[in-house]
Interface confidence: medium
């Protein structure tokens, strides 16, 4: 469905952008941005430019790179206000200024606005064949630019699911786009995967008033259970991809097992009780009955109390334009702890190792 | 002038389908969302979706998401909606608006066009 | 979505009387995403105030529109028999759009 996005990042911050390649004029890509549920992009700050860079640089486009390609931001110039050449901005102005983090961004202007004080002016970025930022360029707010920026903010996110035995993961964020990678969910984001045996299973992210959590998946608990034992960055393996070059053990063991003896493998536990409670139960072809579940545990992993500990992790997705989510389904919830920081973060207490590396996904789904 | 002309009564049997069509007249067709809009009888207001007829563009209300499906001819300046599988609950005026000078208002309306099941 | 609430949904005003109708959102809306339309019976609606405050082409100098973040208002300074209408706020702040369920004005 469209509008379509060619690529969005999100960041732990809760702040989402999102790219699109399509010639409309100004007030036309406001209101696709609102329309997704977003704002026309702003990029006021260092963090906004890191992302909006790493947009552009995930790839050129339609074009191909063979042109440069201007995006509408909101960035702006009343008709009362006039060219100011000594000013960052020329007298220009952000439509939604972010009193925390208003630095302005490191970009120049490709060319000088022109002198005047009584023509409303709008601006857009140009990006050096399509994928890197060269500067602001005033535009006449009628005319059309080649794509345009989003950005959507998100008071609270969930941390990445863990698939276990998942594969076909997909992810489709509340603005409308599918990706089959996400370290960042905002609320409403649905996550399906398939389980082993041609099963079905999915998940939502569902915001309460402080807090985000997968709808029927406790914290830690897998999408899909592991036939084996191990369990590595929350993916199913075998005990050889456990031991690194030095030997040493770095896997975490699945659920009715415990760390050996040996502290280099997993042995069945000697009391363990099956509960249902806090599953995601798998249903083939999504209708049919519950056909394993995913039991509940917790692991050691790693809290982080203060802001600047929260790993600032940016992501880039391809999107792609179809939804392949199946039915969810409905089980008991769980809120994984979040906790707001005076700078506005989100900060994710999670119960196993967060993203800390930046995925790179150029699938459509 | 900006003017939007709306299609005339349509009365539909249950599960039949019905294409309404909106002509826009005094600007740029291309270059603006056109919206829908529904009003069950005594009731209050509902977005259906819009489309951008520059490159047809669509964007929807979850909940009429498999019932209305927008289009738009750019020759003629005309936008249409189909809504399916109509049931007692579609009947309602609805309308066709776009934004023009205001903010994201809805700045210009057609007369409607009232449907009955 | 934001839910819009308006109140009261009837409320009578003779000739003259300041009126004054609310519009509560579910969730923070910016001041320029919430307008409001006036309604006639058998008639589209016509956008009356758009940004919270600004009147629309048209719209007399007595009708004002004030509030922000969950909080809107729309006011008359003194009732005339043409405003006698339906009036509903709308917010375009999220997606999806909504409007308020409308507030029925009536003379007395």
């Known amino acids: 469905e469209h509008p379509t996005a060619d690529r969005a990042a999100c960041s732990a911050s809760g702040a989402c952008y999102s790219l699109h390649h399509a010639t409309f004029k100004r007030r036309a890509a406001e209101e696709a941005c609102s329309l997704r549920g977003g704002t026309l992009s702003t990029v006021h700050s260092g963090s906004e430019f890191q992302a909006v860079l790493l947009l552009l640089r995930a790839g050129p486009g339609p074009g191909g790179g063979s042109k440069d390609l201007l995006f509408w931001v909101a960035l702006e110039r009343s008709i009362s206000q006039c060219t100011q050449e000594k000013e960052p901005l020329r007298g220009f102005s952000w439509l939604h200024p972010d009193s925390e983090d208003s630095e302005d961004s490191p970009l120049p202007w490709v060319e000088e606005p022109q002198r005047s004080c009584t023509v409303r002016k709008c601006a857009a970025l140009q990006a050096t064949r399509g994928v890197e930022p060269a500067g602001w360029k005033e535009m006449r707010c009628h005319l059309r630019t080649d794509g345009y920026l989003c950005k959507y903010q998100f008071e609270v996110l969930c941390p990445a699911p863990r698939p276990g035995a998942a594969s076909n993961l997909s992810f489709q964020a509340p603005f409308r786009l599918s990706s089959s990678a996400l370290d960042f969910s905002p609320p409403g984001t649905e996550v399906s995967a398939m389980c082993p045996g041609d099963l079905s299973v999915s998940s939502t992210c569902i915001q309460e008033e402080t807090s985000a959590h997968w709808d029927g998946l406790f914290p830690g608990t897998v999408l899909c259970p592991c036939s084996g034992r191990y369990l590595l960055a929350g993916k199913c393996v075998e005990l050889p991809d456990c031991l690194d070059h030095l030997g040493d053990f770095t896997c975490e063991c699945a659920v009715g097992f415990e760390l050996g003896k040996d502290g280099r493998s997993c042995e069945t536990k000697v009391e363990e009780q099956l509960t249902l409670e806090g599953t995601k139960l798998p249903t083939r072809n999504v209708t049919a009955t519950p056909a394993g579940a995913v039991t509940n545990r917790t692991w050691p992993g790693q809290v982080y109390d203060k802001p600047g500990e929260m790993p600032q992790v940016t992501e880039i997705l391809q999107w792609g334009t179809q939804s392949t989510l199946p039915t969810i389904q409905k089980t008991p919830q769980t809120k994984p702890k979040v906790t707001g920081t005076p700078s506005g973060s989100v900060v994710l207490n999670y119960t196993s190792s967060p993203p800390v590396s930046l995925t790179f996904d150029t699938s459509s789904t | 002038e900006v003017q939007l002309q709306q299609s005339g009564t349509v009365l539909a049997r249950p599960g039949a389908s019905v294409k309404m069509s909106c002509k826009a007249s005094?600007?740029?067709?291309?270059?603006?969302?056109m919206h829908w809009v529904k009003q069950r009888p005594g009731q209050g207001l509902e977005w259906i979706g819009a489309?951008?007829?520059?490159?047809?563009?669509?964007s929807y209300n979850q909940k009429f998401k498999g019932k209305a499906k927008l289009t738009a001819v750019t020759s003629t300046s005309t936008a249409y909606m189909e809504l399916s599988s109509l049931t007692n609950e579609d009947s309602a005026v609805f309308y066709c608006?776009?934004?023009?000078?205001?903010?994201?208002?809805?700045?210009?309306w057609g007369q409607g066009t009232s449907v009955t099941v | 979505q934001i839910v819009l609430t308006q109140s009261p949904a009837i409320m009578s005003a003779s000739l003259g009387e300041r009126v004054t109708m609310t519009c509560t959102a579910s969730?923070?809306?910016?001041?320029?995403?919430l307008h409001w339309y006036q309604q006639k019976p058998g008639s589209s609606p016509k956008l009356w105030i758009y940004?919270?405050?600004n009147l629309a082409s048209g719209v007399p100098a007595r009708f004002s529109g004030s509030g922000s973040g969950t909080s809107y208002s729309l006011t008359i300074s003194s009732m005339e028999a043409e405003d006698a209408a339906t009036y509903y706020c709308?917010?375009?702040?999220?997606?999806?759009?909504?409007f308020g369920g409308g507030t029925k004005l009536e003379i007395k």
């Open positions: 489309i951008y007829p520059g490159n047809s563009d669509t």
């Open positions: 608006t776009h934004y023009y000078g205001s903010d994201y208002a809805m700045d210009y």
């Open positions: 709308h917010q375009y702040h999220r997606s999806p759009r909504t």
């Open positions: 940004s919270t405050s």
């Open positions: 969730s923070s809306v910016s001041s320029s995403y």
């Open positions: 005094g600007y740029t067709f291309t270059s603006y969302w």
